[in-house]
Every structure is written in C-alpha cells, then in structure tokens.
Interface confidence: medium
C-alpha cells in the first residue's frame, strides 16, 4: 500500500497557511486541481478547485482559500488566509482526471490552528500576518462533485522525520490518528 505521509503546520488564528503541492508537469499541467479536507472515515470534501482547464498563474479564490497553478514549475500553491480554529484538520491536493478517479498529491497537510495573538510579522515562517491582498482578478471555479472512495482515510504506522531549524515550527510525521474535523466554513 502507498505510504501516506503528512506535514503538520501549527498556526495561530488570523495567520495564513501557505503551501505547495507539486505534480508531474507533463501529465497534469492543465488538469483541474482541487484542495480537499479529509474527515475521519468519510470521503474527502472539495473546498476549492482551479478552473478547467487550469490556467497558468491565475488565482482562484473560494472564500478564504486561494489557489494558483504554476504550470511552468509543476506547482499548485494553496493559501488559506485568516485562519480560524475550526479550520484545523487534514487536507490534501488532488488532480481531477475524469473519467478516472482523482489523483492524490502527497504530502497531506495536518493543520492545527490555535487561539491567541499571532505575534509580530515574520515571527512564524509558515504564516503571513494577513498581508495578502486578494488579487482583483481572482475567479471562482466550479468543482466536480465526485470524490474517490479510495481516498477514505486510513492510518499507517507512526514514524517521525527529523526537523531542524529554521524549520523547527514544522513537524513532519506520518499519519497516525485522524481527528474529527468541524465543518469548514
């Protein structure tokens, strides 16, 4: 079985999660991509997706989520701004490739959002203190409704990778237990 790994991001309310999902350039550059939340024992729920076909470097905003697909680099950039405690949960990027099932991109992202002052700008390497101005050209894309039953969460054995400064605020771990996540607003 494929080893499902995850990266853990611990952020404060009001901060921004800013991550990338990399994909095979030749196969998936223009494919529609999505950001999903995974709830315990349920099929992943799509929260935002790029247009179809996906446009290069064209921001798509759905609520507090911004997706940008960099075709030249094989990267999907995902930002979740103004984080709330309820955003805590397990997330993943997928590539839609109908009629086949969505292709999951590793790693999954374990987001833990806690209450409290977010600190001075730059104090957390994984956050931005709400400085992002949402580009005026953002568009909202319609996402396919189907999800893959194969991506229902299962927990592989625990294993922890080392992290050293300046990455000390990020803990890379394998999936252990999947917490129940409140509905994403």
């Amino acid at each position: 079985a494929t080893k499902l790994t995850e990266e853990k991001y611990e952020l404060k309310e009001g901060q921004t999660l800013d991550v990338k999902c990399d994909y095979t350039l030749e196969k998936f550059a223009s494919s529609q991509k999505a950001w999903q939340i995974i709830r315990d024992g349920e099929m992943p729920k799509t929260l935002a997706c790029t247009e179809r076909p996906s446009k290069n470097s064209h921001p798509v905003q759905v609520g507090r989520i911004i997706l940008e697909d960099y075709h030249d680099h094989g990267l999907l950039r995902v930002r979740m701004v103004n984080l709330q405690v309820e955003d805590s949960g397990l997330y993943q990027c997928v590539i839609y490739q109908p009629p086949k099932e969505p292709h999951m991109l590793f790693d999954r992202i374990r987001l833990v959002v806690t209450k409290g002052f977010s600190g001075t700008p730059g104090s957390n390497e994984n956050s931005t203190q709400n400085v992002y101005k949402i580009p005026p050209t953002t568009t909202k894309a319609l996402c396919p409704l189907y999800t893959s039953p194969r991506t229902v969460t299962q927990a592989p054995p625990k294993s922890t990778a080392d992290v050293s400064t300046p990455d000390s605020e990020i803990n890379l771990t394998n999936v252990t237990d999947i917490i129940r996540v409140p509905v994403f607003n």
């Epitope: 990338k20 590793f106 730059g122 203190q129 990778a161 300046p166």
Partner: antibody, heavy 122, light 108 residues
C-alpha cells in the same frame, strides 16, 4: 550535523556537459528539497532550480529549461545537477543547498554545500 | 519575476559601528518569505535571517532583520571583524526565487 558535500572542480569545453554531485548527511534526506544556486565570478547568486528528494519532482528556472537536469539517489542521499551544452557564461561556482520541508511554499537555503567550480573554456 | 535591489552596493565602516543594509522589492513580498545571507570570500553563503526577522541557528543577536511589503532591512548592531562580507537578500514568495545583487560591507 547537517552537511552537504559536493564533488570537485571541473574544466569543460563549450558544448560539453557537466554533472555535479551533492552528498547529504545528518538529516532525513527525503524530507527536504535540494536546490542548486550558481555564482559567476564576481557576480551575485542565481537560483537554478530544485528537486524534491521526497518524490523526485523538479522545478527549473526558465532560462535553464532544456539544458539542466536535477536528480537524486535516495539510497546514497545524493543529489545531482547536470548542465548540458555548456557555454562560457556557465563558468561559475555551483552550490547545492537544502530547502525547507517538501510542502512549504517558498524556500530559503540552509545549509549550503562548499561549492563546485565549473570552468567552461576552449 | 520579483527584482530585489540592495543598497548601498558597498558600505565602508569600522568595527564597532552599526551597519544598516537595505533590500527593496519590485513588488510586495510577504515578510514570511524574505531571507538574508552572508558570504565571505571563497566560502558558500550562510543563512542569517529567515521570515524577515527570525535568526537562523547559531547567528549572534547583533544581526536583526525587519521590514514588510517592499522594504526590508538587515541591521548589524556592532560590527565585529568577522562580519565584513557580502550580504544578500532573497525572496521566496514568487517563482523564480531571486536574490538581491548584494551589499559588500568592508573595513573603512
């Protein structure tokens, strides 16, 4: 101690290829990306691209697309950078550097290899 | 691509003095994705500051970073003899990652 050790200096003729190696130690190789940065004599730093040691995905600077190939050998924790069709303006010190963990957007580099001098001359 | 312009090109100071180095971006850069490096002759660069203001491991507290948006500053509160080197800023918010042209801090 996290360390990157690069291969030795190379002298090449225009049109040839060069392959520089970068052996990592002191950390879990597959948890981080390896970036390549070059510095022409007396000049500043130029980011060339990076490879994810986790899944082998590569991202290259636009100006080097088609001439550069970055690879890794996870069994030996070694990254490689091959540059083809060498020109005189490729003469530079080539550095490998460790990036941040695989999913973080944005990258800065720590630590760096000691550098490999590549001289392209006829 | 984001262009980073560093000034001054050369800074001539004496040990014990305060050094203020500037890095200006052609467009807004989140402070979370701005770094500073030090490079001495014949050596590889060394990470000093990441996230605009966080010191990397082992970097003395005389080095500090600040700024947001398009203007960032590296300050060395009291120059030590080993601080005379070239300093580069780097942005990591927009591909391709780019470096500034560098500021050389030399002994006056």
């Amino acid at each position: 101690q996290v360390q990157l050790v690069q291969s030795g200096a190379e002298v090449k003729k225009p049109g040839a290829s060069v392959k520089v190696s970068c052996k990592a130690s002191g950390y879990t190789f597959t948890s981080y990306g390896i970036h390549w940065v070059r510095q022409a004599p007396g000049q500043g730093l130029e980011w060339m691209g990076w490879i994810s040691a986790y899944n082998g995905n590569t991202n290259y600077a636009q100006k080097l697309q088609g001439r550069v190939t970055m690879t890794t050998d996870t069994s030996t924790s070694t990254a490689y950078m091959e540059l083809r069709s060498l020109r005189s303006d490729d003469t530079a010190v080539y550095y490998c550097a460790r990036g941040r963990p695989s999913s973080s957007w944005g990258n800065w580099f720590d630590p760096w290899g000691q550098g490999t001098t590549v001289t392209v001359s006829s | 691509e984001i262009v980073l312009t560093q000034s001054p090109g050369t800074l001539s100071l004496s040990p014990g003095e305060r050094a203020t180095l500037s890095c200006r971006a052609s467009q807004s850069v989140s402070s979370s994705f701005l770094a500073w490096y030090q490079q001495k002759p014949g050596q590889a660069p060394r990470l000093l500051i990441y996230g605009a203001s966080s010191r990397a491991t082992g970097i003395p507290d005389r080095f500090s970073g600040s700024g947001s948006g398009t203007d960032f500053t590296l300050t060395i509160s009291r120059l030590e003899p080993e601080d005379f080197a070239v300093y580069y800023c780097q942005q990591a918010v927009s591909l391709p990652w780019t470096f500034g042209g560098g500021t050389k801090v030399e002994i006056k």
